[in-house]
């Protein structure tokens, strides 16, 4: 689809004549009829093919023809096709003479013909005029033309249709020949594909615009070159998406379980050393003058009970000072001015004589100590109670009360996380230090086997393109349900792309 | 425990800023993106913005483009979300939360109500 | 953006009651799906990820399934404790999108 335009620029009838040499009256009001149409080693009259087109009265005599001159005309006058340009043309130009208004050939008489010029031949199209110059005995025209493509019509015959656009069906404009040229940061047959950030990873990432980089399912990052770790993962790395690799001092499915408790949480306080002893399980070890499970309490010098037959203990800067109740004297209360005439045992102690009635010893019931059974024995002063667990006094016993994960009189020994068969199906328990882990069977998952699976072929991500993976049941391996546009046992292959 | 606790939010006018902060316990904060999703009073959910763990890449949906700014402080555990030039719309309230536009959104703070009103 | 409808936007039940919960994508979202549950006055918690991955805690009550562009939330057994608006996210394409909502009450 194009136009041929003509240019018509000067016409010249000095004498005012038509074609049959009779003088125009009172002048020549002269337009013009075009006719044109395909070519013709001798231009015949006939049909115009490629089409036809008339002016207004555009001067009298002769004239010079202004562009779009004024009078309702065009100038260039428009030849409009909508087919293929062939190549070759044959132009018909008539001048006639306008007695009145009317210009329709039938209005008219055939001798109102002023002259008639016809040439033919080869023209391409371009941008460029062509000029000629027709000359008959007594009148001259000057003129130009050219065949141009209409609007989104390109290559060398006008039949090359190419709209641009920027939308979502493509981003481009189009080159002289009808070929799409891309705008920046598309690519594609139609430049319908953007181009990603440089760098983006060619299977982890994708765009739907220029420079932008979005991840797939599993990959963050710039680039999308990094892994997101699993959804449950709390202290953990991944290399491969939804993977949880534990951190130093973690353990565990998702690696929330603490195995350094006392460098992540430091318990122990006033300077106590402190020593992991299992899954969020510690051991303080005081130093002198505290005491506590978290070394938290301060000691006085008094806590040691030194003031002996119910002497009352003193905390002073440099110690402590006993003062001793009546009948006792010496730095702890240890010596007597009494007697067992004095009745100086307590809690239903019984009193012995010595030294002649000098002195006295008394003979403690069970659960009382101290040279008068004033104090009541602490069987937990000794901490025989190991990893953590804590001594309470019973009557005449001790008893320790074991942390999670102990057990035994003295929390000695470690509790078995596998006693209590955790692993269903069948499944394998391991005790490890961090916890217990199932190994499960094949057809179950999950952390304690309770989840029923098919092998899972598709675990590997051996689909590519964004296939779709299933597993098949019957013989455990995968099958790829490829998106339109690839093939192959993985979608690894663009449609029309085979393997190399 | 996974603890998610969000801070900052308030009564702003229109064209307004304001900084939330998010501060994060019970996992190792610098392996993880973040997210912030809103919820407009009576409304459903909606993804505002995420960054990725270690190279902090942000991600934002189109209305909040050029106004909303993630960030993160790997050493202080903490996500920010900074609002610039706030519309009525931005109204919500604004939660802190471990995920990645590509992944679900595994733990939430509580939440923090932002309120834009004249 | 892809756009997630939940239906039914509301629904009443029973303890006991097993309950269906539907979403549907505006295009092929694979299995990148999940289920969140939110209370009043609460923030979301994520029950199934995956399509059908129970998450870390959550009662194997909940159960998730689907692919491709229709996925279903089922509660076999209603607890007291599960009346609440549950949504579910597409995580496929970008950006994230979630459905509006259905909120289960009690019959």
């Known amino acids: 689809s194009g136009v041929f335009q003509l240019q018509l620029q000067e016409f010249v009838n000095e004498r005012g004549v038509l074609a049959s040499g009779r003088p125009c009256e009172p002048g020549c009001r002269t337009f013009f009829r075009v006719c044109l149409k395909h070519f013709q080693a001798v231009v015949s009259p006939g049909p115009c093919t490629f089409g036809s087109v008339s002016t207004p009265v555009l001067g009298t005599n002769s004239f010079a023809v202004r562009d779009d001159s004024s009078g309702g005309g065009r100038n260039p006058l428009q030849l409009p096709f909508n087919f293929t340009w062939p190549g070759t043309f044959s132009l018909i130009i008539e001048a006639w003479h306008a007695p009145g208004d009317d210009l329709r050939p039938e209005a008219l008489p055939p001798d109102a013909l002023i002259s008639k010029i016809a040439i033919q031949g080869s023209l391409a199209v371009g941008q460029n005029w062509l000029l000629d110059e027709q000359t008959s005995t007594l009148t001259r025209l000057r003129y130009s033309y050219r065949v141009i493509c209409s609007d989104n019509y390109y290559g060398d015959n006008c039949s090359r249709l190419c709209k641009k656009r920027n939308d979502h069906f493509g981003h481009y404009v189009c080159q002289p020949d009808g070929n799409l040229s891309c705008l920046p940061g598309w690519t594609g047959e139609y430049c319908q594909q953007p181009i990603c950030l440089s760098g983006c990873h060619e299977q982890n990432g994708y765009c739907s615009k220029p420079a932008e980089c979005l991840c797939r399912p599993g990959w963050q990052g710039r680039l999308c070159n990094e892994c997101i770790p699993h959804n449950g993962c709390r202290h953990g790395t991944c290399s491969t998406p939804w993977q949880c690799t534990c951190d130093e001092g973690w353990g565990g499915l998702f690696c929330d379980q603490d195995l350094n408790y006392c460098t992540h949480h430091s318990p122990c306080k006033n300077g106590a050393t402190c020593s992991n002893s299992g899954q969020r399980s510690y051991t303080c070890t005081c130093r002198p003058g505290y005491t506590g499970v978290d070394c938290e309490l301060e000691l006085s010098e008094c806590d040691s009970n030194p003031c002996r037959n119910g002497g009352s203990c003193k905390d002073q800067e440099d110690g402590y000072h006993c003062l001793c109740p009546p009948g006792y004297y010496g730095l702890h209360c240890e010596h007597s001015t009494l007697s067992c005439a004095d009745s100086p045992c307590f809690n239903g102690g019984s009193c012995r004589e010595r030294n002649q009635g000098a002195s006295y010893a008394c003979e403690c019931p069970p659960n009382f100590t101290g040279s008068n059974c004033e104090k009541k024995v602490d069987r937990c002063t000794s901490n025989p109670c190991a990893n953590g667990g804590q001594c309470l006094n019973r009557g005449p016993s001790r008893m320790c009360r074991c942390r999670p994960g102990f057990t035994g009189t003295y929390c000695e020994r470690h509790v078995s996380d596998c006693a209590r068969n955790p692993c269903a199906h069948g499944g394998t328990c391991h005790d490890l230090e961090s916890g217990l882990m199932c190994t499960c069977p094949a057809g179950f998952s999950g952390r304690r086997c309770e989840v029923r699976t098919s092998i899972d072929a598709c675990a590997s991500s051996p689909c590519f393109n964004r296939a779709t993976c299933y597993t098949d049941l019957s013989t455990d391996t995968f099958v790829c349900n490829c998106p339109y546009g690839f093939v192959g046992s993985r979608c690894e292959f663009p449609v029309g792309l085979p393997p190399s | 425990e996974v603890q998610l606790v969000e801070s900052g939010g308030g009564l702003v006018q229109p064209g307004g800023s304001l900084r939330l902060s998010c501060a994060a316990s019970?996992?190792?904060?610098?392996?993880?993106?973040m997210a912030w999703v809103r919820q407009a009073p009576g409304k459903g959910l909606e993804w505002v913005a995420t960054i990725s763990s270690s190279d902090a890449w942000p991600s934002y949906r189109d209305s909040v483009k050029g106004r909303f700014t993630i960030s993160r402080d790997n050493a202080k555990n903490s996500l920010y979300l900074q609002m610039n030039s706030l519309r009525a719309e931005d109204t919500a309230v604004y939660y802190c939360?471990?995920?990645?536009?590509?992944?679900?959104?595994?733990?939430w703070g509580q939440g923090t109500l932002v309120t834009v009103s004249s | 953006d892809i756009q997630m409808t939940q239906s039914p936007s509301s629904l009443s039940a029973s303890v006991g009651d097993r309950v269906t919960i539907t979403c549907r994508a505006s295009e092929d979202i694979y299995s990148n799906l999940a289920w969140y549950q939110q209370k009043p006055g609460k923030a979301p918690k994520l029950l199934i990820y995956d399509t059908n991955n129970l998450a870390d805690g959550v009662p194997s009550r909940f159960s998730g399934s689907g692919s491709g562009t229709d996925f279903t939330l089922t509660i076999s057994s209603l607890q007291p404790e599960d009346f609440a608006t549950y949504y579910c996210?597409?995580?496929?394409?970008?950006?994230?999108?979630f459905g509006q909502g259905t909120k289960l009450e009690i019959k």
């Open positions: 019970g996992f190792t904060f610098r392996h993880f993106p």
């Open positions: 939360s471990r995920g990645y536009y590509n992944s679900p959104f595994a733990y």
């Open positions: 996210q597409q995580y496929n394409n970008y950006p994230p999108t």
